[in-house]
């Protein structure tokens, strides 16, 4: 195995608010990552940078610094929140997200995350990209893995 493994687990929660005048949607999306240290020594997770894309447009960015130290042969689960804004040329989504006649207002977002660990002055970066379903019509808490885009496309076992 590589010395550090990063696994994007999924969306943990999405909290939504609206600006009626600006026809803008604000989504605070909390994601969960598992970082595993396969080394014999502790590693320092220096930062996590994340961004969210909708329809190939970046709608939110976040950066966490001095995250944690992970011991040898250990795994830590880390939550991080990305504030996103769907507005302007995407304001047409406001109508979909606020439509009362439908129960679930799922949109597909691309989650990108990069974890940086530092080794004696040089950095190792590990990146992940995942498509996730997020409900833009209400506050939602997800079971881990429940928002996975590809999982939803699979037939039920």
């Amino acid at each position: 195995p590589r010395s550090i493994d990063v696994k994007y687990i999924g969306v943990k929660s999405a909290y939504v608010s609206y600006d009626v005048q600006k026809r803008t949607i604000y989504l605070n999306i909390t994601n969960t990552l598992n970082i595993t240290n396969n080394n014999y020594y502790s590693v320092e997770v220096e930062n996590i940078t994340a961004q969210v894309q909708f329809s190939k447009t970046v709608i939110g960015k976040a950066r966490l610094n001095n995250i944690t130290i992970i011991g040898p042969l250990d795994m830590k689960q880390i939550d991080y929140t990305v504030p996103t804004v769907i507005a302007e040329e995407m304001s047409y989504m406001y109508d979909f997200c606020t439509l009362i006649s439908i129960k679930v207002h799922n949109i597909v977002l691309m989650m990108q995350v990069t974890v940086t660990t530092t080794y004696f002055g040089h950095s190792e970066q590990i990146s992940q990209e995942r498509y996730q379903y997020v409900d833009c019509g209400r506050n939602t808490t997800y079971q881990l893995g429940q928002s996975e885009y590809l999982n939803v496309l699979q037939p039920q076992q």
Epitope: S3, N39, Y40, Y41, S42, V43, E44, I69, G71, P72, L73, D74, M75, Y119, F120
Partner: antibody, heavy 122, light 112 residues
């Protein structure tokens, strides 16, 4: 002072299992790794595996094909090694040892248990 | 697996002699942080192994300075400058860079 006290000698039947313990004292148990080493009579040393008692994370020597299972109990500062489906080739002395670590570096096996003799015989 | 080849298997010496034990790894044992984790242990009859040298050349506390380790890449050496009676036993090199970690086959230091 640092001590690793291992359980006593075992005489066991083929096909059964045995659990060897290694009780740590004199240091912070969860701040060190515990390694296990095998020595067959008159033979050299063979690395079995390692556990981080703080997290329960393990690495094993795959050549031993799941023979050993390593666990640790933080409350009693004790590491365990369970050996299963025992055969005559598992007759050996088993040692535990501690290994220190820090950020981006680790140390050697500086303290060892006295060894536990396991004899597999019908 | 990384094969650790130790020579000689047996090393008869007289007390006060110099002794040298070689350990060769079948591949580089530099770990991903740039360090080489090659260790030397001495096991006396009926006892647990004891740490002598770590990271190729660092003497463990309490180990006499007549013991020295050297080497890099795949070739490593343990030297004893003046052998004393308490030094007799089996010496093992051990690499901690590639899983499974592996010991050398051992070198028995004995009186001529």
């Amino acid at each position: 002072q640092v001590q690793l006290q291992q359980s006593g000698a075992e005489l066991v039947r083929p096909g059964t299992s045995v659990k060897v313990s290694c009780k740590a004292s004199g240091y912070a148990f969860t701040n060190y790794l515990i390694e296990w080493v095998k020595q067959r009579p008159g033979q050299g040393l063979e690395w079995i595996g390692v556990i981080n008692p703080g997290s329960g994370g393990t690495k094993y020597n795959e050549k031993l094909k799941g023979k050993a299972t390593l666990t640790a109990d933080k409350s009693s500062s004790t590491a365990y090694m369970q050996l299963s489906s025992l055969t005559s080739v598992d007759s050996a002395v088993y040692f535990c040892a501690r290994r220190g670590y820090t950020i981006y570096d680790f140390y050697a096996m500086d303290y060892w248990g006295q060894g536990t003799s396991v004899t597999v015989s019908s | 697996d990384v094969l650790m080849t130790q020579t000689p298997l047996s090393l008869p010496v007289s007390l006060g002699d110099h002794a040298s034990i070689s350990c060769r790894s079948s591949q580089s044992i530099v770990y991903n942080n740039g360090n080489t984790y090659l260790e030397w242990y001495l096991q006396k009859p009926g006892q647990s192994p004891k740490l002598l040298i770590y990271k190729v050349s660092n003497r463990f506390s309490g180990v006499p300075d007549r013991f020295s380790g050297s080497g890099s890449g795949t070739d490593f050496t343990l030297k004893i400058s003046r052998v004393e009676a308490e030094d007799l036993g089996v010496y093992y090199c051990f690499q901690v860079s590639h899983v499974p970690f592996t010991f050398g086959s051992g070198t028995k230091l004995e009186i001529k």
